[in-house]
């Protein structure tokens, strides 16, 4: 089995997590991709996913999560904006490849969000930017449900998660339209 490694990101409330997940573009360019949270003792839960097939560079926003899949570059960009302490946890990028198990990209992300004034609001990077606007996308994200012979079959989600503008106050911990997706490496 592949050794799962973690990359720690320590950010303050209000900042933005900005993760670049690389993939082999010839293989996975149009595959559907997802951002998942992994809670202790639970299967990974999908918080947001790209469309199927994934659209090149087209942003998909679910609450405070923005996914951008750059087919030309083999890169999935994941941003979680306006971070809250309760967003702390373990996350991962995956590629859906039915009927096989989802394929994990990149290292898992150990996000630690602490209280305190953020000197660079809207970003976890150095203040090298002069423009940072979050587009008000209105895409609906329908994430598939996959099961594995090694996991319990689960019921499909009640509905799709509506996309909201950056002004929306949606806590990731309160998102109900999430899907459990098993990931094995």
């Amino acid at each position: 089995a592949t050794k799962l490694t973690e990359e720690k990101y320590e950010l303050k409330e209000g900042q933005t997590l900005d993760v670049k997940c690389d993939y082999t573009l010839e293989k996975f360019a149009s595959s559907q991709k997802a951002w998942q949270i992994i809670r202790d003792g639970e299967m990974p839960k999908t918080l947001a996913c790209t469309e199927r097939p994934s659209k090149n560079s087209h942003p998909v926003q679910v609450g405070r999560i923005i996914l951008e899949d750059y087919h030309d570059h083999g890169l999935l960009r994941v941003r979680m904006v306006n971070l809250q302490v309760e967003d702390s946890g373990l996350y991962q990028c995956v590629i859906y490849q039915p009927p096989k198990e989802p394929h994990m990209l990149f290292d898992r992300i150990r996000l630690v969000v602490t209280k305190g004034f953020s000197g660079t609001p809207g970003s976890n990077e150095n203040s090298t930017q002069n423009v940072y606007k979050i587009p008000p996308t209105t895409t609906k994200a329908l994430c598939p449900l996959y099961t594995s012979p090694r996991t319990v079959t689960q019921a499909p989600p009640k509905s799709t998660a509506d996309v909201s503008t950056p002004d929306s106050e949606i806590n990731l911990t309160n998102v109900t339209d999430i899907i459990r997706v098993p990931v094995f490496n």
Epitope: D72, N126, T128, Q129
Partner: antibody, heavy 116, light 107 residues
Framework: EVQLVESGGGLVQPGGSLRLSCAAS????????MSWVRQAPGKGLDWVAS????????YYVDAVKGRFTISRDNAKNSLHLQMNSLRAEDTAVYYC?????????WGQGTLVTVSS | EIVMTQSPATLSVSPGERATLSCRAS??????LAWYQQKPGQAPRLLIY???IRATGIPARFSGSGSGTEFTLTISSLQSEDFAVYYC?????????FGGGTKVEIK
């Protein structure tokens, strides 16, 4: 085939200005981040600036912040770099590149020489 | 700013031999690392991204490995066209930064 053709380089005095342009073809320009990377004579590579497809995000290296402005015209498939208050240390070949983080395609570059 | 350090500065290798180039980051860049090749008078060319994924059209003799702060580019059997300068670059954080380069020359 991806093509990136830079223009606008030349000799300029310290404190002067230049506007570099890049004509892009062979790919969907409006779907791609674009950047400028420079290379001083006999030296290594230095990232200068990056711009998102819709210009909603723009980033600069500290050394050029406040002096250089990256912009794009998606209707004309063109990328620009307005360089003001030029210094001797800005002397370099400037490459137009496709990508905002890592760089898949490069132009052949245009030489900017800042000297009195 | 993440500082990228490449070693050695110059590597003398005979054609057909293996070349191993190193790149170290001053802090973790996860797998957000790319390698480029530049020949005299030419623009750089992307070889590897995501630390280990070969870019389109890159021969299998080029391979990348590593994660976090330590990375390696290996050229399994050097061909005449491989003698060039190689740069690593991190793209985890702004500002994007390159290593100083390793020149691979004929021994």
């Amino acid at each position: 085939e991806v093509q990136l053709v830079e223009s606008g380089g030349g000799l300029v005095q310290p404190g002067g200005s230049l506007r570099l342009s890049c004509a892009a073809s062979g790919f969907t320009f409006s779907s791609n981040w674009m950047s400028w990377v420079r290379q001083a004579p006999g030296k290594g590579l230095d990232w200068v600036a990056s711009i998102k497809q819709d210009a909603s995000e723009i980033y600069y290296v500290d050394a050029v912040k406040g002096r250089f402005t990256i912009s794009r015209d998606n209707a004309k498939n063109s990328l620009h770099l307005q360089m003001n208050s030029l210094r001797a240390e800005d002397t370099a070949v400037y490459y137009c590149v496709r990508g905002g983080w890592r760089f898949e395609s490069w132009g052949q570059g245009t030489l900017v020489t800042v000297s009195s | 700013e993440i500082v990228m350090t490449q070693s050695p500065a110059t590597l003398s290798v005979s054609p057909g031999e293996r070349a191993t180039l190193s790149c170290r980051a001053s802090q973790s860049v996860s797998s957000n690392l790319a390698w480029y090749q530049q020949k005299p008078g030419q623009a750089p060319r992307l070889l590897i991204y995501g630390a280990s994924i070969r870019a389109t059209g890159i021969p299998a003799r080029f391979s990348g490995s590593g994660s976090g702060t330590e990375f390696t580019l290996t050229i399994s059997s050097l061909q005449s066209e491989d003698f060039a300068v190689y740069y690593c670059q991190q793209y985890k954080n702004w500002p994007l930064t390159f290593g100083g380069g390793t020149k691979v020359e004929i021994k």
